[in-house]
Interface confidence: medium
């Protein structure tokens, strides 16, 4: 026979997640920190298409004779968005220049906006973050996640999707940004670098921080994530910086420890329910806020990026672990999967609490605090 | 592609060349039709290596991919009268953009008649 | 390892008419990775639906799939002639199980 030819946050608890000011004197940013992270969205950072097929590979089936089959690609007809709120938009990142590139890569060819024009937009993330230039803003009130503690059964789908690991979610994960602003989480992954490299996307004060947790919602105002790609507020992301401590995170570990199963890139495996809570800070109240994109393609804009204060803290051989474990494509190891802060271009990041009235080190002249854009909200 | 005959104890093999693209990036399956009856998944690859098979034939079925031919195969080892049917090859489409989704098959074969007996 | 059962195994109607075949699962299909395809004599299987509910490219607007959890229905609102053939429901969770398939026979 022949045939022609798919990550965004949860609380620790016990308030022994990580440190509560993740902006200490000792993490200002080294030198040997990767260029990328000081790049504007050059065509280097600019991912390649991801696995959904190009136009041109989709192929009709011509039969031969029983000896020499052939599946042809040519032809081949596409998926049209499924109707499922977990699914993405099929069309949203095709390949339309036909040049085989069925996975887009970090800091290669092809660039990111001929992936997805998107990817060169005015609004992209990740950003850097600089608390001292945050707006706080009252209206912003604790972040509301119900339906997070998951029962072992049904156990949940943890894939290497050859950019990073990613964690399906279940119906029934509810978050809630404010009043109004509901949310239905629909997967989790991590972004991370390599020995002595941190990996983090968002960086604060120009640190990096050695890894980044995602859980990506849709709101529930979208019955489809196709349907809410571009849209302001369709999609909702909660990032927490992950750090270095002296213990090892048991709710991480569930996870971690899965890691070597799927080693291979397109492998996955099943691990029983957790509570995806515990894997992210445990102060729900004192986080930046700012609509951003997606940080890999599409690239699509409209997205709500909450990014805790406070971070999670893993063991040194934990994190070991995340970085060192996986592979990507072309016999690569998968590190360093973070794409360049991008430019903010005007937008102003709120903040839950006055991050711009404390005694920073880092203060080297009085800066003037901007306003609050949503006290209406 | 492979032999429509194959007698019972043998392996069975058979190829699948994907044509008109590249079977990087893509999930391949194996699916099975034995006469008169429905379908039965038999496994995937992706193009990496990585396999899933069908708990019940695990223990007697390997599937590989040569990328460098555009092509997957599939062995079925100490075969019986059971094993007899049509062979369908098969693209098993799941997304690997920043949601994972599954698709379904959307590219198949024509499917190959293979026959065992002695 | 989840099982599908499809009913009925036989569908006798006349072109023009409204066809439901369902597609019960032995347990909730994960986050609805549930599939159609129909296969003509002769001939390889055709996706139609995935998603449970999405329709692939090419696939006429009267196919049409509802359904979650445990229970999915395929619907082909007004038969023609060409509809006449096997459809099987297919899921993807742990590992990949096809239904036993139904038949839509001409009357």
């Known amino acids: 026979q022949r045939l022609p030819r798919m990550q965004e946050d949860s609380p620790l608890g016990g308030g022994s997640s990580g440190e509560d000011d993740p902006l200490g004197e000792e993490d200002l940013p080294s030198e040997e920190d990767s260029p990328r992270e000081e790049d504007p969205p050059g065509e280097e950072d600019l991912p390649g298409e991801e696995d959904l097929p190009g136009e041109e590979d989709l192929p009709e089936v011509k039969p031969k004779s029983e000896e020499e089959g052939s599946l042809k690609l040519e032809d081949l007809p596409t998926v049209e968005a499924p109707g499922d709120p977990q699914e993405p938009q099929n069309n949203a990142h095709r390949d339309k220049e036909g040049d085989d590139q069925s996975h887009w890569r970090y800091g290669g060819d092809p660039p990111w906006p001929r992936v997805s024009p998107a990817c060169a937009g005015r609004f992209q993330s990740p950003v850097d973050i600089r608390p001292q230039l945050a707006a706080f803003c009252p209206a912003l009130r604790p972040l509301e996640l119900l339906g997070f503690q998951l029962p072992p059964l049904p156990e949940l789908r943890l894939r290497n999707n050859g950019h990073s690991v990613q964690l399906t979610l279940p119906p029934g994960l509810e978050m809630a940004l404010g009043p109004g602003r509901e949310y239905r989480a629909l997967q989790l992954h991590l972004h991370w670098g390599a020995a002595g490299r941190p990996g983090s996307e968002h960086t604060v004060e120009g640190h990096r921080f050695p890894a980044e947790i995602h859980v990506v919602h849709l709101s529930t105002a979208f019955a489809r994530v196709d349907e809410a790609l571009g849209r302001p507020g369709g999609l909702a992301v909660l990032a927490a910086f992950l750090e270095e401590g002296p213990e090892e995170n048991s709710a991480y570990e569930q996870l971690l420890s899965r890691l070597e199963e799927i080693a291979e890139e397109g492998s996955e495996t099943q691990v029983p329910g957790l509570d995806i809570s515990a894997l992210l800070p445990s102060d729900f109240s004192r986080y930046f806020q700012y609509e951003g994109s997606l940080t890999t393609p599409p690239c699509a804009q409209g997205v709500i990026w909450t990014v805790f204060n406070q971070t999670v803290m893993l063991s040194a051989k934990q994190l070991h672990t995340l970085s060192d474990t996986l592979w990507g494509p072309g016999d690569s190891r998968l590190q360093l999967n973070f794409r360049a802060t991008q430019p903010l271009n005007g937008r102003v990041i709120e903040a839950s609490f006055p991050a711009g009235v404390d005694s920073s080190p880092r203060a080297a002249e009085p800066v003037q605090l901007n306003s609050c854009l949503a006290a209406g909200d | 592609s492979g032999p429509g005959l194959v007698k019972p104890s043998e392996t069975l093999s058979l190829t699948c060349t994907v044509s008109?693209?590249?079977?990087?990036?893509?999930?391949w399956s194996w699916i099975r039709q034995p006469p008169g009856k429905g379908l039965e998944w038999i496994g995937y690859?992706?193009?990496?290596?990585?396999?899933n098979y069908n708990p019940s034939l695990k223990s007697r079925v390997t599937i590989s991919v040569d990328t460098s031919k555009n092509q997957f195969s599939l062995k079925l080892t100490s075969v019986t009268a059971a094993d007899t049917a049509v062979y369908y090859c098969a693209r098993d489409q799941h997304s690997s953009s920043v949601y994972y989704y599954y698709y379904g098959m959307d590219v198949w074969g024509q499917g190959t008649t293979v026959t065992v007996s002695s | 390892e989840t099982q599908l059962t499809q009913s009925p195994g036989t569908l006798s109607l006349s072109p023009g008419e409204r066809a439901t075949l369902s597609c019960r699962a032995s347990q909730s299909i994960y986050i609805n990775y549930l599939a159609w395809y129909q296969q003509k004599p002769g001939q390889a299987p055709r996706l139609l639906i995935s998603g449970a509910s999405s329709r692939a490219t090419g696939i006429p607007d009267r196919f049409s799939g509802s359904g979650s959890g445990t229970d999915f229905t395929l619907t082909i609102s007004r038969l023609e002639p060409e509809d006449f053939a096997v459809y099987y429901c297919?899921?993807?969770?742990?590992?990949?199980?096809f239904g036993g398939g139904t038949e839509v026979e001409i009357k």
């Open positions: 690859i992706y193009y990496s290596g990585s396999t």
């Open positions: 297919q899921q993807y969770g742990r590992s990949l199980t």
């Open positions: 008109g693209g590249s079977i990087s990036s893509y999930y």
